[in-house]
């Protein structure tokens, strides 16, 4: 490093068609004493120095053509009132050369093999001719401040193309790049930037959540897929067609569009982009119920957290078959779904599965004309004891004086597996409670050879997983027939 | 942990009659079934019964001859097998598992299973 307070190196190199030569240095101290800088060939004509004046507070100056030759060496010194400033410095005009900058070419093509690519094809500067030259390149997304070096150098003689990788979908990027003699210095200047646009990606897996084939005019359905890249905000144009009538949803956030009744098909597509593609072309029809897979079955997985289910095939081979899932009370938007090749008559859906918690479990068999789906089958990682018991009440005597009474369902959720039976019991002012299991099946007892007074009922559920905590009392009181609740 | 063990095998004469008991011990399960394997052949379900609801499932070739039920006392589930055929000659199987929906005699979904019981139809 040079001692603190003296002048900064002094560089010189050729710039541009013309050739001039350009050198510069760090401000001076004495920035009033213009310097003077000499040059001296050493290769062609080395008895003659030429001086250059500099204009007053300038830390540069350009040597004119005709003062020296070209592929010359150049010995360059300079001095300021008489005294030397820098050490001399050697120049080769061959090698110390400024290159223009490379021109890149507009047509940017993208590519979606595993990622997303780009490549720009680009022509080597104008100046210096006929010389091999290393050019860099770079990259960033528009917003950026930093830029991403692109490797390896590539040489004029070649010009490969210049390739971008791991782009993300539906981003602005840009691209520049500079060129510098091999072998020589210094980097000509970064060229002005090449924008470009990556496409958006199509989603990668579309299909219907809720009541799409349902025929008792509850038909509540959502269109939903996958993000590709869950990290770009992207909207989406949906079309929904029947017939001769097209609708279309323009910027829909992701995932999912309400399906407008009567719908017989359904494409997703990124932004405002028109190429509709097969795999997001999804056929609302519904199907005959004997084109749907049969024998559903579902089961805990042993020693794994997933969820096991097997089928077997309708009347016909589908495309494929689609497994969706949703947690018991979750809105439309929050289904899983895994699609499976026609010969695949079971899988294990992959996820954390909560014990205690019910889950929808649909297999539709996916056919080019249309969707047939078996009946959904709830299913349990593992059943838990119920949280709650039934309500109950007191129906009409039957016959008069013998007290009916009835109990309702266990919300799904608070259930937490399937009921395998209820446990009623009576309890009489001052006697012991005698209970008794009824079937799963069963929701009202009759209460014959009751003495008078007064009585307390209430009902438990059971799971596998054992019972759960009584519900609600019922006051009964003989003969007045008249309710109360606790 | 589910702990599974049948009795009751032996040899018949055909037209006679078995009952197949399968003891289970700390189940957290809804469905059991019988399953059999003769030599050489596949696996097949024979009859299953869900374990409170009562609910039960036959295979086409036992149904009218065999009936599965349980008693909750004994937290048993029995096959009672009548009219048995040489053809029922096989290697009984009780199991069990946490089972929804239609596949009651698909051995996929139950993941606990017997040692066995040997049953033997002569003609």
């Known amino acids: 490093t040079r001692p603190h307070g003296s002048p900064g190196p002094l560089q010189c190199y050729s710039v541009g068609p013309l050739g001039i030569l350009n050198c510069s240095w760090e401000p001076l101290g004495d920035l009033e004493t213009p310097p003077v800088l000499y040059h001296q060939s050493q290769k062609y004509h080395p008895n003659r120095v030429w001086e250059v004046k500099v204009p007053s507070k300038q830390s540069w100056v350009t040597i004119p053509r005709e003062q020296f030759t070209m592929a010359d060496k150049l010995l360059i010194w300079g001095t300021q009132k008489g005294r030397p400033l820098w050490s001399s410095v050697s120049v080769n005009l061959e090698t110390q050369m400024k290159p223009d900058t490379p021109q890149i070419f507009s047509q940017v093509d993208i590519s979606e093999e595993a990622t997303l690519e780009a490549t720009v094809q680009w022509a080597p500067p104008v100046w210096p001719p006929q010389k091999v030259l290393i050019c860099q390149f770079r990259y960033k997304e528009c917003q950026a401040e930093t830029w991403t070096r692109l490797e390896p150098q590539l040489k004029t003689d070649g010009l490969t193309p210049v390739e971008m990788q791991n782009l993300e979908p539906g981003t602005c990027y840009q691209v520049s790049g500079r060129c510098q003699v091999e072998n020589g210095y210094p980097w000509g200047e970064w060229s002005s930037p090449l924008s470009f646009q990556t496409p958006f990606l199509d989603p990668e897996d579309v299909w219907v959540s809720g009541t799409v084939c349902e025929t008792s005019g509850k038909r509540a359905a959502l269109l939903v897929w996958k993000d590709p890249r869950p990290c770009v905000q992207v909207t989406y144009t949906v079309w929904f067609g029947a017939g001769d009538i097209t609708t279309t949803q323009e910027e829909v956030p992701c995932c999912k569009s309400p399906v407008p009744a009567w719908m017989e098909w359904a494409v997703v597509s990124p932004g405002n982009s028109t190429s509709w593609v097969p795999p997001t072309n999804l056929s609302l029809v519904c199907l005959a119920p004997e084109s749907a897979p049969c024998d559903v079955g579902v089961s805990s997985a042993d020693g794994s957290p997933g969820i096991k289910v097997t089928w077997k095939q309708g009347t016909r081979k589908p495309l494929e078959y689609v497994v969706d899932w949703a947690q018991d009370g979750d809105s439309l938007d929050k289904l899983n779904w895994t699609r499976l090749p026609p010969g695949n008559l079971s899988t294990l859906l992959p996820g954390e599965f909560k014990g205690g918690v019910p889950y929808r479990i649909t297999v539709t068999a996916v056919y080019s004309g249309g969707l047939a789906a078996a009946p959904s089958v709830w299913g349990f990682r593992e059943e838990l004891v119920p949280l709650a018991g039934p309500a109950v009440w007191r129906l009409p005597d039957d016959p008069p004086g013998t007290p009916v009474v009835a109990w309702g369902e266990v919300p799904r959720h608070q259930l937490r597996g399937q009921a395998t039976h209820y446990t009623f019991c009576i309890q009489s002012r001052g006697l012991s409670t005698v209970c008794r299991n009824v079937s799963s099946q069963t929701q009202t007892a009759t209460l014959p050879n009751l003495h008078l007074g007064s009585f307390k009922l209430w009902v438990t559920v059971s799971t596998v997983a054992g019972q759960g905590p009584p519900g609600p009392n019922l006051s009964l009181h003989l003969p007045d027939n008249r309710i109360r609740w606790k | 942990q589910v702990q599974l063990q049948e009795s009751g095998g032996g040899s018949v004469q055909a037209g006679g009659s078995l009952r197949l008991s399968c003891a289970a011990s700390?189940?957290?399960?809804?469905?059991m079934g019988w399953f059999r394997q003769a030599p050489g052949k596949e696996r097949e379900g024979v009859a299953a019964?869900?374990?409170?609801?009562?609910?039960?499932y036959y295979a086409d070739s036992v149904k009218g001859r065999f009936t599965i039920s349980q008693d909750n006392a004994k937290n048993t589930v029995d096959l009672q097998m009548n009219s048995l055929k040489p053809e029922d000659t096989a290697m009984y199987y009780c199991?069990?598992?946490?089972?929804?929906?239609?596949?009651?005699?698909?051995?996929?979904?139950?993941?606990?299973w017997g040692q066995g019981t040997q049953v033997t139809v002569s003609s």
């Open positions: 199991a069990a598992g946490l089972v929804y929906g239609e596949a009651w005699l698909d051995s996929r979904h139950y993941n606990k």
């Open positions: 019964i869900s374990i409170g609801g009562g609910q039960t």
């Open positions: 700390g189940y957290s399960i809804n469905r």
